[in-house]
Amino acid sequence: ATKLTEEKYELKEGQTLDVKCDYTLEKFASSQKAWQIIRDGEMPKTLACTERPSKNSHPVQVGRIILEDYHDHGLLRVRMVNLQVEDSGLYQCVIYQPPKEPHMLFARIRLVVTKGFSGTPGSNENSTQNVYKIPPTTTKALCPLYTSPRTVTQAPPKSTADVSTPDSEINLTNVTDIIREQKLISEEDLEQKLISEEDLHHHHHH
């Protein structure tokens, strides 16, 4: 198994974590996907999941978590709005593939939320779109009770995350400091680790 990787995100209370999970292959487009938290010594706990089958560009909201699955680009967007200190923890994005165990899509996210704001109020042009206001047309999906004791055994393809906050509260002057990106491994590797029983020859993107 490939060594697990983690990406650390340090955000302020009230900000929004905006993560894009890259699932790449069309066969996963309709698969149910979930956002999980991993607490020490416990199995991953599902906080929110898409519908089954997962619908295209259809927001699913559970509390302050919003999931949107963009089939046409192979991306699952996960937003956690109005972050609180107690949201700090380790998170991951998975694809449900019953009866197989869920599989992680990208590096685990180590989220650290601290009190207070950085920057000054005013224009927020450098920030990503303001997603603080939760879309009114969201659906709440039922998530499987099943969580895997060994959800992740593979390195990630890619994730990116960024933040935004209400314009009236904060101006991010250097969004690139908060946007972090992880390089892709090959999609053959992803396919093999997620669904294929074949013994394929792999190459890695560096």
Epitope: H71, H73, T160
Partner: antibody, heavy 121, light 111 residues
């Protein structure tokens, strides 16, 4: 090793038809969209179209220049993609490449060597 | 359709010098913070070869003198120190929208 081998090119008269094949090996063919790209002699690359996978109902997309005349299909059991070209014009003369992407709207990492189609009277 | 315009059409650079090729899209090729813009190298008689994917990711096996940057509508391919084997035509390509499109190509030569 991923391999793509095009065949079926040749000389055809304007208005005629030709069917190109792309035989794939070294990967799970049914998992990936397949594309056709062409290149006229001394000119640039032109995307012709693509066919998606079964999970996307084998949806096809085409460049405006070939829409209505060209049809892309695939046979997953034979690991082969096809380009059916009808009502051929002289400006369709080109080397036709079969290419495989790396997933949904991803880059073309694998290319065949191409097959030459000449449309001339 | 998204039109990709490369500049310059041709470029002559001395060995060991930096070569820069630009690609401008008629509209954004980004979805969220992913840029669906890729760079290819083509030598005579050969199919294109992938160099850079998603604007800035180096394809496996490609020398690290090649790099890509940009987002939205403006992108750049840079060769930090030109080698003789880099003589080729370079293309940008977008896959954010159908139909996929290529730039017209930039011919790179040795000065």
């Amino acid at each position: 090793e991923v391999q793509l081998v095009e065949s079926g090119g040749g000389l055809v008269q304007p208005g005629g038809s030709l069917k190109l094949s792309c035989a794939a090996s070294g990967f799970t063919f049914s998992t990936y969209a397949m594309h056709w790209v062409r290149q006229a002699s001394g000119k640039g690359l032109e995307w012709v179209g693509r066919i998606r996978t079964k999970s996307s109902n084998y949806a096809t997309y085409y460049a405006a220049s070939v829409k209505g005349r060209f049809t892309i299909s695939r046979d997953d059991s034979k690991n082969t993609a096809y380009l059916q070209m009808n009502s051929l014009k002289t400006e369709d003369t080109a080397v036709y490449y079969c290419t495989r992407d790396m997933g949904i709207r991803r880059q073309f990492a694998y290319w065949g060597q191409g097959t030459l189609v000449t449309v001339s009277s | 359709d998204i039109v990709l315009t490369q500049s310059p059409d041709s470029l002559a650079v001395s060995l060991g010098e930096r070569a820069t090729i630009n690609c401008r899209a008629s509209e954004s090729v980004d979805t969220f913070d992913y840029s669906f813009l890729h760079w290819y190298q083509q030598k005579p008689g050969q199919p294109p070869k992938l160099l850079i994917y998603r604007a800035s990711n180096l394809e496996s096996g490609v020398p690290d003198r090649f790099s890509g940057s940009g987002s939205g509508t403006d992108f750049t391919l840079t060769i930090s120190s030109l080698q003789a084997e880099d003589v080729a035509v370079y293309y940008c390509q977008q896959s954010n929208e159908d139909p996929y499109t290529f730039g017209q190509g930039t011919k790179l030569e040795i000065k």
